[in-house]
Amino acid sequence: EDELQVIQPEKSVSVAAGESATLRCAMTSLIPVGPIMWFRGAGAGRELIYNQKEGHFPRVTTVSELTKRNNLDFSISISNITPADAGTYYCVKFRKGSPDDVEFKSGAGTELSVRAKPSAPVVSGPAVRATPEHTVSFTCESHGFSPRDITLKWFKNGNELSDFQTNVDPAGDSVSYSIHSTARVVLTRGDVHSQVICEIAHITLQGDPLRGTANLSEAIRVPPTLEVTQQPMRAENQANVTCQVSNFYPRGLQLTWLENGNVSRTETASTLIENKDGTYNWMSWLLVNTCAHRDDVVLTCQVEHDGQQAVSKSYALEISAHQKEHGSDITHEAALAPTAPLGGSG
């Protein structure tokens, strides 16, 4: 008879993680007597995957009934494949011997590659908020995919971004890979409702990419604009001064009225008017009894927004000679504007 040949017909096999991999092997002869074994890798460090002779291999089943003598098919199936199973598998015929069986002939090997889906991309933004016209960085991470080839794109409100840097690790061969990308985004005043999207395409996703999103509302701070005006009053001994706080984000805002530099009242914005662009407006007013003042009054609206340094706007309230003759206590109260005089985004 011709000398036994070990035939592994497939050079490579690709399997999705979680599926079973069939590794084919056939012998051309039954001689010599002895077991066949499957190994992953070659050389001294090779890993035994299946031994016809002995052992417990719960994930491995033989494709054919090996107890039939005329069987020359020594293919195996490995269940529940993970990326860690990737490698080159060798079907090896041994000759019965002692103290150990003697390797007689090996197949050429079959490379098993495992297609593993990337994890859902996680997008994270900056730790602190930034104001419009500033650049912030967003990161996108995904792990556990194989093979290494992967495509990552960034979008802002559907528009593809170009200012980003992407790394796939490790650089060399591995059972699975990770991707890390950092995108630089210039903020605009209208970005409260904006989203950045990290989109990942991979062979395992069959054309249906994975997306991770982050809201720019978590990254942006739009400082308010202030406008202090005097409203007309019927009673000539009262002045109504309003402070219109416009187009700010996020909500957190504290307003303080000062009369000639002295704190008159502090209040925290509660019921806000939301603009279409996601920013907020708020109005506070101060009723001033002009009779109580002998001289002109400087009224200051001071706003502390989102824990930042206060901004202020002052208004000089002129006291007429007639009003200066009558002395009276100052009265003031705050009220919410029934409408937002300033709408839209700047």
């Epitope: 002779k53 107890t67 039939k68 019965k96 002692s98």
Partner: antibody
Framework: EVQLVESGGGLVQPGGSLRLSCAAS????????MHWVRQAPGKGLEWVSA???????YYTGSVKGRFTISRENAKNSLYLQMNSLRASDTAVYYC????????????WGQGTMVTVSS | DIQMTQSPSSLSASVGDRVTITCRAS??????LAWFQQKPGKAPKSLIY???SLHSGVPSKFSGSGSGTDFTLTISSLQPEDFATYYC?????????FGQGTKLEIK
């Protein structure tokens, strides 16, 4: 059903000859290594001879040159030609099938008695 | 030739007992060791191959272990049908050789 049935045993004088047969059923005999094992009365088991799937033959020292193992694929049968028989060859002779990949004995015939006596 | 030595040659035990028979090879035989059971007037029956693998249909009360030169056959709970003679055999190289047998008798 896988089965081995031996025949051809009997009483023979020292120096005589005998041909044992083993008819296999339920499997193809030529696909297996086949063996003859004997057991002298009141004694243990002794391996006698084997024939491999390639026709290679093996014998224990005491029968070498006197016994010949062979098979006939068309009849799915195994044979043991015994010449120059001695009293020490008296035994029950069993036909045995070797296992699939390691030649471990798995199927035994019921045996046939060979008596060498004058 | 490889010599196979069994011990003990005979053994008396009771139903329900756990018994162990040992077999020693004169040289390393890897794990190409088989065990057979034979009852008077009957052909041997194959129990175990490659030291620890049970042949089809053999009850799990039979177990084998060992590698190299020292091997054991254990019967976990003796039943009346288990009283017989047991043989070990090496089949790593020709000539295949058997142990002299261990006769297991009812006490």
């Amino acid at each position: 059903e896988v089965q081995l049935v031996e025949s051809g045993g009997g009483l023979v004088q020292p120096g005589g000859s005998l041909r044992l047969s083993c008819a296999a059923s339920g499997f193809t005999l030529s696909s297996y290594d086949m063996h003859w094992v004997r057991q002298a009365p009141g004694k243990g088991l002794e391996w006698v001879s084997a024939i491999g799937t390639a026709g290679d033959t093996y014998y224990t020292g005491s029968v070498k040159g006197r016994f010949t193992i062979s098979r006939e694929n068309a009849k799915n049968s195994l044979y043991l030609q015994m010449n120059s028989l001695r009293a020490s060859d008296t035994a029950v002779y069993y036909c045995v099938r070797g296992g699939v990949w390691d030649d471990a004995f798995d199927i035994w015939g019921q045996g046939t008695m060979v008596t060498v006596s004058s | 030739d490889i010599q196979m030595t069994q011990s003990p040659s005979s053994l008396s035990a009771s139903v329900g007992d756990r018994v162990t028979i040992t077999c020693r090879a004169s040289q390393d035989i890897n794990n190409y060791l088989a065990w057979f059971q034979q009852k008077p007037g009957k052909a041997p029956k194959s129990l175990i191959y490659t030291a620890s693998s049970l042949h089809s249909g053999v009850p799990s009360k039979f177990s084998g272990s060992g590698s190299g030169t020292d091997f054991t056959l254990t019967i976990s709970s003796l039943q009346p049908e288990d009283f017989a003679t047991y043989y070990c055999q090496q089949y790593v190289s020709y000539p295949y050789t058997f142990g002299q047998g261990t006769k297991l008798e009812i006490k």
